[in-house]
């Protein structure tokens, strides 16, 4: 199917009323016209745009575009209409930033000025130079009034500034000195926080872009969810599940009269909510619009549950994962609760929060035991590894930003909110505050914000997820706000279920088909798993008992 945004390459057709028709008959949103991006792919959305005033340091293309002045006449067309390289522009025009303009209008490299060789056809590159005897060039003592910039541009590749004593090489905006004399492009995108989502580095500058489904907020330059359902924040307060619309800021009760609900998660596509009740020792599910009716609340798991404190829904493969701090296990089940197995029953002390990345096939969890840590493994329980084990005490909530591939967590003993990339690198402490992070518990991320609940403050806070600034209170007087999730379709991007792509149903697995972590292109897409009392047979698909009926309990 054709990209809905691009409209395909079919026969001539009318675009929607809020779309612009390109010359090549593509349809693009009207707001993309004259935004200096070639969205049509034939430049027609950037032609005939109102002339805009370019900055003094820019060159104005004939079609109104602005480009860096130094790109003019550099042999590469940067203007969509090529006017930066036209004869009219480049004949007797201003030379590039690292060039000297000869009297006849031609350009030579600035470092060739005053090098005692004639480089300009008219010799003007040697005019007005201080004639230094050859023997003096090696003399380090500087005669008063000597301007080194006049000789060979001081050796600077771009800008040479004469000083009272000596001289200084500097660079135009977007460039940096590499070796005191030579300018090279600054890769602003090396800073993971240069942009809220995608950073594209160009020579001398960079540009921020957004992933599909998001659009740039022209004021803040942050990526916001494109028009669609309003995002909402759903949280538990032990006795209820509540909802806050993040746009309208209205507040509603989703599920009343609960006993002791701490953990919850959502499946956006089916509009279902999942939650654990610590007192009843059960995991439940319901459609969000019917969840307030106890008759519509389905019990999924009520066997071998002790203290299910963390819950995560794999919306792609239709599984739920939960931590149990009483049994000291991490388990998985189908979303109907019908098939389940224990993935981890060893080396867990106080497992709490859990989050899943079904796109890459990984899960992440926090453990606030004596040796607190954040761990990750494949969604099938393989490749277990520790992500964070130092400077961590009580990691209560964790959440994933699948777009930036970062994990965020709150530590209620250190009063900190931190983030780290999915491989355990680039750790950043965003906020350290006994006021705003008095006893944080749950955490969620959406767009440019991070949200967290705080038990002592009885409030939900938000802050900028890149730098921890702009802290504000979203809701207060909440009485025990615990887990928190954002409900929006962009939080759960669609992907293929590897177990369904297989020729055999359920990947040929007799019991559970679990996605495998996608570490390389050779990684298996899934593996099979069996109930806790059975073993995977030699075909790695079917389940068998050994002689002892009840021998096996949680693996790995």
């Amino acid at each position: 199917a054709a990209d809905p945004l691009l409209g395909g390459q079919g026969p001539a057709k009318e675009c929607e009323k809020d779309q612009f028709q390109c010359r090549n008959e593509r349809c693009i949103p009207s707001v993309w016209r004259c935004d200096e991006d070639d969205d049509c792919l034939d430049h027609s959305d950037e032609d005939d745009c109102p002339k805009k005033t370019c900055a003094d340091s820019d060159f104005t293309c004939d079609n109104g575009h602005c480009i860096h002045e130094r790109w003019k006449c550099d042999g590469e067309e940067e203007c969509p209409d090529g006017s930066d390289e036209s004869e009219a522009t480049c004949t007797l025009g201003t030379c590039h930033g690292n060039e000297f303009q000869c009297g006849d209008g031609t350009c030579v490299l600035a470092i060739k000025r005053c090098n005692q060789e004639q480089d300009c056809p008219d010799g003007s590159d040697e005019a007005g130079c201080l004639q230094v005897p050859p023997t003096f060039l090696g003399n380090r003592r500087r005669p008063r009034g000597l301007n080194e910039c006049l000789h060979n541009n001081g050796g600077c590749s771009h800008i040479c500034t004469d000083l009272k004593i000596g001289f200084e090489c500097t660079c135009p905006a977007g460039f940096q000195l590499l070796d005191q004399k030579t300018c090279g492009d600054i890769d602003e995108c090396k800073d993971p926080d240069a942009c809220s989502q995608i950073c594209v580095n160009y020579k001398g500058y960079f540009k921020c872009e957004c992933y599909p489904g998001y659009e740039m907020d022209l004021l803040t330059k942050n990526c916001k969810a494109a028009a669609g359902k309003s995002p909402s924040l759903i949280f538990t307060n032990r006795h209820e599940v509540r909802r806050i619309d993040l746009v309208k800021r209205n507040y509603s009760r989703l599920i009343p009269m609960l006993k002791n609900v701490v953990a919850l998660d959502m499946e956006v596509a089916t509009n279902r909510i999942y939650w654990c009740d610590l007192s009843y020792r059960k995991i439940y599910s319901a459609y969000m619009d019917k969840a307030s009716d106890p008759k519509e609340q389905e019990v999924l798991i009520d066997e071998q549950l002790h203290s299910p404190e963390g819950l995560a829904v794999d919306w792609v493969h239709k599984h739920i994962y939960w931590t149990d701090s009483g049994n000291k296990t991490i388990s998985v089940a189908t979303v109907d609760g019908g098939r389940r197995c224990t993935l981890f029953s060893r080396n867990l002390s106080e497992p709490r929060a859990i989050a899943v990345d079904p796109l890459q096939g990984f899960m992440y969890w926090s453990d606030w035991g004596n040796q607190a840590k954040i761990e990750k493994s494949g969604l099938n329980g393989v490749d277990r590894q520790t992500l964070v084990s130092d400077n961590i005490e009580w990691p209560n909530g964790i959440t994933l930003d699948l777009l930036s591939q970062r994990l965020y967590w709150v530590d209620s003993k250190l009063h900190q909110l931190s983030s780290i990339d999915f491989s355990g690198g680039n750790r950043k402490m965003l906020i350290s505050s006994t006021d705003f992070l008095s006893h944080p518990f749950g955490i969620a991320v959406f767009e440019d914000k991070v949200f967290w609940t705080d038990l002592e403050n009885e409030a939900i806070f938000s802050a900028n997820r890149l730098n921890g600034l702009e802290i504000s209170i979203l809701a207060e007087n909440l009485n025990n706000p615990h887990d928190i999730v954002i409900f929006h379709e962009l939080k759960q991007p669609r992907a293929a279920d590897a177990c369904k792509l297989s020729v055999q149903p359920n990947g040929g697995c007799e019991y559970l088909c679990l996605p495998a972590p996608q570490i390389s292109s050779h990684s298996p897409k899934y593996t099979c798993a069996c109930p806790d009392t059975m073993w995977l047979g030699p075909d790695m698909k079917r389940c068998y008992r050994d002689g002892n009926e009840d021998s096996k309990m949680g693996s790995t």
Partner: antibody, heavy 118, light 108 residues
């Protein structure tokens, strides 16, 4: 060896109630869902009730819902089936069955006959 | 609910014959089918699960196959102790559990 032994059957008048029992041995009873399956004379098998390991949830087909109640006592390794408002179509051999971890019934008792007279 | 249609209801056979019983589900059951043998006055005995997996004490002359909605059960070389009734069962970890109507294998 897994053993399931049913008891409590017999001839009962229509409209009355009856409670069947099943004594289990040879396995950890509390680890398994248990079920009752019946078979009318010269007819096929029909599943009538299942109970979860802790006894907190039970399942029935629509045909018996409201009249049949399955229960269990894990301390005694016993399964029960309470049948109320007996009808002539409840006449059958009732089998106690263990639901294996993969979902099918892997062990069965020998059955107990219930005859409902009008 | 899923219905299981088993055929034929009765199947005459001689010793040494190969016989096949079929079960058709009203919708795709993803290979979750088991086959049972029942002799008069006895409890059913599990022979095959997950379409084709033989229980450890099931003789190799028994086999099962199928996918989607259509499944079959075969005895390659009928022996005298095989004359009995056979039932298919669609199972899952959650209800309902649905049996086929049964097939009586009789001596021709």
């Amino acid at each position: 060896e897994v053993q399931l032994v049913e008891s409590g059957g017999g001839l009962v008048q229509s409209g009355r109630s009856l409670k069947l029992s099943c004594a289990a041995s040879g396995f950890t009873f509390s680890n398994y869902y248990m079920a009752w399956v019946r078979q009318a004379p010269k007819k096929g098998l029909e599943w009538v009730a299942t109970i979860t390991t802790s006894g907190s949830r039970s399942f029935y087909p629509d045909s018996v819902k409201g009249r049949f109640t399955i229960s269990r006592d894990n301390a005694k390794s016993s399964l029960y089936l309470q049948i109320n408002s007996l009808k002539s179509e409840d006449t059958a051999t009732y089998y106690c069955a263990r639901r294996g971890p993969l979902g099918y019934f892997d062990h069965w008792g020998r059955g107990v006959m219930v005859t409902v007279s009008s | 609910d899923i219905q299981m249609t088993q055929s034929p209801p009765s199947l005459p056979a001689s010793l040494g014959d190969k016989v096949t019983i079929t079960c058709q589900a009203s919708q795709n059951i993803n290979k979750y089918i088991a086959w049972y043998q029942q002799k008069p006055g006895k409890a059913p005995r599990l022979l095959i699960r997950f379409t084709s997996t033989l229980e450890s004490d099931t003789p190799s002359r028994f086999s099962g196959s199928g996918s989607g909605r259509d499944y079959s059960f075969s005895i390659s070389n009928v022996e005298s102790e095989d004359f009995a009734s056979y039932y298919c069962l669609h199972y899952d970890n959650l209800p309902p559990w649905t049996f086929g109507g049964g097939t009586k294998l009789e001596l021709k």
